[in-house]
C-alpha cells in the first residue's frame, strides 16, 4: 500500500481467483483513542471500532473512502483504490491501446517545435467517475523539470457503437534550449482513476524524435504567362523554431487530381517555393518535415489548381 | 527519403555541402547497423545516449546561433577554449565565435574518426564478419575536416593489446553511431546558418 | 470546484410520493459515493441515503422500502425517490458527493438543499 495524495492509498492486488488480497491497517489520524467507530463510504454499518482497523482487501467491494468517527463527528478519511496485477502485468484497462506507432502505446505525444513544449493524448471509451493527474520530467535519476497543465477532455468520436474520449495536457520543459542535443529523455507518468480502480501509464521519448511541425502558411499559387505551370510559394510556419536558417525545414509539393486514383506528382524542395504543372479540378498541397533529422511531416496545406 | 540532392553553388559557404554529405553517410551507416544488429540493443530506445565529446568540446554552445544567446537556458557552459583560423571562414565573415565554433566541430571530427578507426579495426577481427563501418562516411569525415583545414595535433589511434569483445565493440558502435547522428545534425544546422549569415 | 443543485422539494400529503434530483457541474473526477442527507428543525443532520463505487446502497432503518436512491452517471445526477411520505419525513434535504479529483485530491461537496414538507 503507498500513499497518492493526502488521504488516497493504493493497494496494489494480485489479481487471479481466490486470491488471498491484501491486509490493511488503517489509523484514525486523530489523538483520540476511546469511543473511535469506522464506517465505508457513507454508510451507517459499523465495520469496526478502535483507533485503528484491519482489512483484508480482495476486491472492489472492499476500497472505498473509510471514516472514522467519534460521537457523530468525523475524525479522518482514507480512500483506498485498487491498482491490479495480472499474471505479473498491471492493468491497462482505462486507456485505448492507439497501437501507433507500436502495440501498447497508450500516451502519443507530439511537439511543434524545439522550444521543449509539447502535447501528449489519450483515448479511452469511459466516459464518467474519470480522472487524471500528469507529471514530467527529464531524466529520471536526476530529474530535471517539466510542467504539465491539467489533463482536459479534447475530442469526442463515435467509433462504431462506441464513443470515445481523447484527453490531453500540454506540458514545457522548464529550462529548454532549443539547440541543445538531448541526452537524456523525456519521462510522462499519467496516473489514471475510474470509480475505485487506479492505473498508471508511462512514456519515453526525446523531443526531437516526437517533432511534427504545423502545415506550411499562407500557401498561394502564382500562374507563369503563356505556360500551364505555376510558381507554388510558402513560409515557415509561426510555431516552428528561430532562426530558420538554423532550425532549417524540407518541404513536400504534392499535385493532387480530383480522384484518389489519379498519379499523384510530387517535387521535394529546401526552398519556399515550387514550380509545378497545374492540372485542371486539381488541387496543391505542401506539407513540411525537419530538414536534417527526419521525424514526422506536417499535416498538408492545400490550395486549389483554378 | 529519395529527395533530390542540389548541387552547391560555386561561391557558396564551402563547408555545407561536406556537412550535408556527412549527415547523408552517418545515417546511411546508422541505418544499416540497425537492420545487420538486428538483435542487439541498437535502437534510440535501447542505447544508452553517451558524448564521448562531453567535458572536451562545446560545439552547441560555441555555435550558438545570436538569436538564441539571449536564452539563459542555452548559455549554461559557453566555453571559449579554442581560437584558431580555418578555410571555411571566408575573411569577411571572420570572428572570434565562428572561428570558435569551426574549430569545436573540428575537434569533434577528430574524436570520432579516431573511435571509428579503432572500432573498425577490432570489427575487422570478428570471425562473423557481420559489420563494418562504411568506408564512404570515413572519407565523408576526412573531407569535411580537409574543409575546416585546422592545425591540429593528430591523435594516434588507440590500440588494444586485449582480445576484442565483438558483442560489446558493437554496441559500442551502436552508441557512438546515434551520438555522432545528433552531433552532425548540429553541425548541418550551424553550416546552413552560418551559410545564411 | 464541484457544485451541487438539488430540485424536486415540495409539499406533499402523507402517503404521497416526491422525486428529487441533485446535478453536480465542475470538475467532478472520480465518483467515491453520493449521499441524501435530511435536517428537520432542531435536530442533527442525518443520513438518509447514500450510494457507493465499490458497494450497493445502503438506507437509514426508517426509509427502508420506501425511499430509492440511483443515479445516472452520464449526466453527473443523482435522485431520491421518495414514497409512502410521512409527516417525519418533513425536513430539508441535501445532496451530498464525495469524490477525487487527482490534480486537487479528495473533496466533499454539498448542495444548498430543498425543502420537503408533508402535511395534509
Known amino acids: 500500500i503507498w500513499e497518492l495524495k493526502k488521504d488516497v492509498y493504493v493497494v496494489e492486488l494480485d489479481w487471479y481467483p481466490d486470491a488471498p488480497g491484501e491486509m490493511v491497517v488503517l489509523t484514525c489520524d486523530t489523538p483520540e483513542e476511546d469511543g473511535i467507530t469506522w464506517t465505508l463510504d457513507q454508510s451507517s454499518e459499523v465495520l469496526g471500532s478502535g483507533k485503528t482497523l484491519t482489512i483484508q482487501v480482495k476486491e472492489f467491494g472492499d476500497a472505498g473512502q473509510y471514516t472514522c468517527h467519534k460521537g457523530g463527528e468525523v475524525l479522518s478519511h482514507s480512500l483506498l483504490l485498487l491498482h491490479k496485477k495480472e499474471d505479473g502485468i498491471w492493468s491497462t484497462d482505462i486507456l485505448k491501446d492507439q497501437k501507433e506507432p507500436k502495440n501498447k502505446t497508450f500516451l502519443r505525444c507530439e511537439a511543434k517545435n524545439y522550444s521543449g513544449r509539447f502535447t501528449c493524448w489519450w483515448l479511452t471509451t469511459i466516459s464518467t467517475d474519470l480522472t487524471f493527474s500528469v507529471k514530467s520530467s527529464r531524466g529520471s535519476s536526476d530529474p530535471q523539470g517539466v510542467t504539465c497543465g491539467a489533463a482536459t477532455l479534447s475530442a469526442e468520436r463515435v467509433r462504431g457503437d462506441n464513443k470515445e474520449y481523447e484527453y490531453s495536457v500540454e506540458c514545457q520543459e522548464d529550462s529548454a534550449c532549443p539547440a541543445a542535443e538531448e541526452s537524456l529523455p523525456i519521462e510522462v507518468m499519467v496516473d489514471a482513476v475510474h470509480k475505485l480502480k487506479y492505473e498508471n501509464y508511462t512514456s519515453s521519448f526525446f523531443i526531437r524524435d516526437i517533432i511534427k511541425p504545423d502545415p506550411p502558411k499562407n500557401l498561394q499559387l502564382k500562374p507563369l504567362k503563356n505556360s500551364r505551370q505555376v510558381e507554388v510559394s510558402w513560409e515557415y510556419p509561426d510555431t516552428w523554431s528561430t532562426p530558420h536558417s538554423y532550425f532549417s525545414l524540407t518541404f513536400c509539393v504534392q499535385v493532387q487530381g480530383k480522384s484518389k486514383r489519379e498519379k499523384k506528382d510530387r517535387v521535394f524542395t529546401d526552398k519556399t517555393s515550387a514550380t509545378v504543372i497545374c492540372r485542371k479540378n486539381a488541387s496543391i498541397s505542401v506539407r513540411a518535415q525537419d530538414r536534417y533529422y527526419s521525424s514526422s511531416w506536417s499535416e498538408w496545406a492545400s490550395v486549389p489548381c483554378s | 527519403r529519395n529527395l533530390p540532392v542540389a548541387t552547391p553553388d560555386p561561391g557558396m559557404f564551402p563547408c555545407l555541402h561536406h556537412s550535408q554529405n556527412l549527415l547523408r553517410a552517418v545515417s546511411n551507416m546508422l541505418q544499416k547497423a540497425r537492420q545487420t544488429l538486428e538483435f542487439y540493443p541498437c535502437t534510440s530506445e535501447e542505447i544508452d545516449h553517451e558524448d564521448i565529446t562531453k567535458d572536451k568540446t562545446s560545439t552547441v554552445e560555441a555555435c550558438l546561433p545570436l538569436e538564441l544567446t539571449k536564452n539563459e537556458s542555452c548559455l549554461n557552459s559557453r566555453e571559449t577554449s579554442f581560437i584558431t583560423n580555418g578555410s571555411c571562414l571566408a575573411s569577411r565573415k571572420t570572428s572570434f565565435m565562428m572561428a570558435l565554433c569551426l574549430s569545436s566541430i573540428y575537434e569533434d571530427l577528430k574524436m570520432y574518426q579516431v573511435e571509428f578507426k579503432t572500432m573498425n579495426a577490432k570489427l575487422l577481427m570478428d570471425p562473423k564478419r557481420q559489420i563494418f563501418l562504411d568506408q564512404n562516411m570515413l572519407a565523408v569525415i576526412d573531407e569535411l575536416m580537409q574543409a575546416l583545414n585546422f592545425n591540429s595535433e593528430t591523435v594516434p589511434q588507440k590500440s588494444s593489446l586485449e582480445e576484442p569483445d565483438f558483442y560489446k565493440t558493437k554496441i559500442k558502435l551502436c552508441i557512438l553511431l546515434h551520438a555522432f547522428r545528433i552531433r552532425a545534425v548540429t553541425i548541418d544546422r550551424v553550416m546552413s546558418y552560418l551559410n545564411a549569415s | 470546484e464541484v457544485q451541487l443543485v438539488e430540485s424536486g422539494g415540495g409539499l406533499v400529503q402523507p402517503g404521497g410520493s416526491l422525486r428529487l434530483s441533485c446535478v453536480a457541474s465542475?470538475?467532478?473526477?472520480?465518483?467515491?459515493?453520493w449521499g441524501w442527507y435530511r435536517q428537520a428543525p432542531g435536530l442533527e443532520r442525518e443520513l438518509v441515503a447514500s450510494d457507493a463505487s465499490g458497494g450497493r446502497p445502503n438506507y437509514q432503518d426508517s426509509v427502508k422500502g420506501r425511499f430509492t436512491i440511483s443515479r445516472d452517471s452520464a449526466k453527473n445526477t443523482v435522485y431520491l425517490q421518495m414514497n409512502s411520505l410521512k409527516p417525519e419525513d418533513t425536513a430539508v434535504y441535501y445532496c451530498?458527493?464525495?469524490?477525487?479529483?487527482?490534480?486537487?485530491?479528495?473533496?466533499?461537496?454539498w448542495g444548498q438543499g430543498t425543502q420537503v414538507t408533508v402535511s395534509s
Open positions: 465542475g470538475s467532478i473526477g472520480s465518483v467515491v459515493s
Open positions: 451530498n458527493l464525495r469524490g477525487l479529483q487527482l490534480d486537487m485530491g479528495l473533496y466533499d461537496s
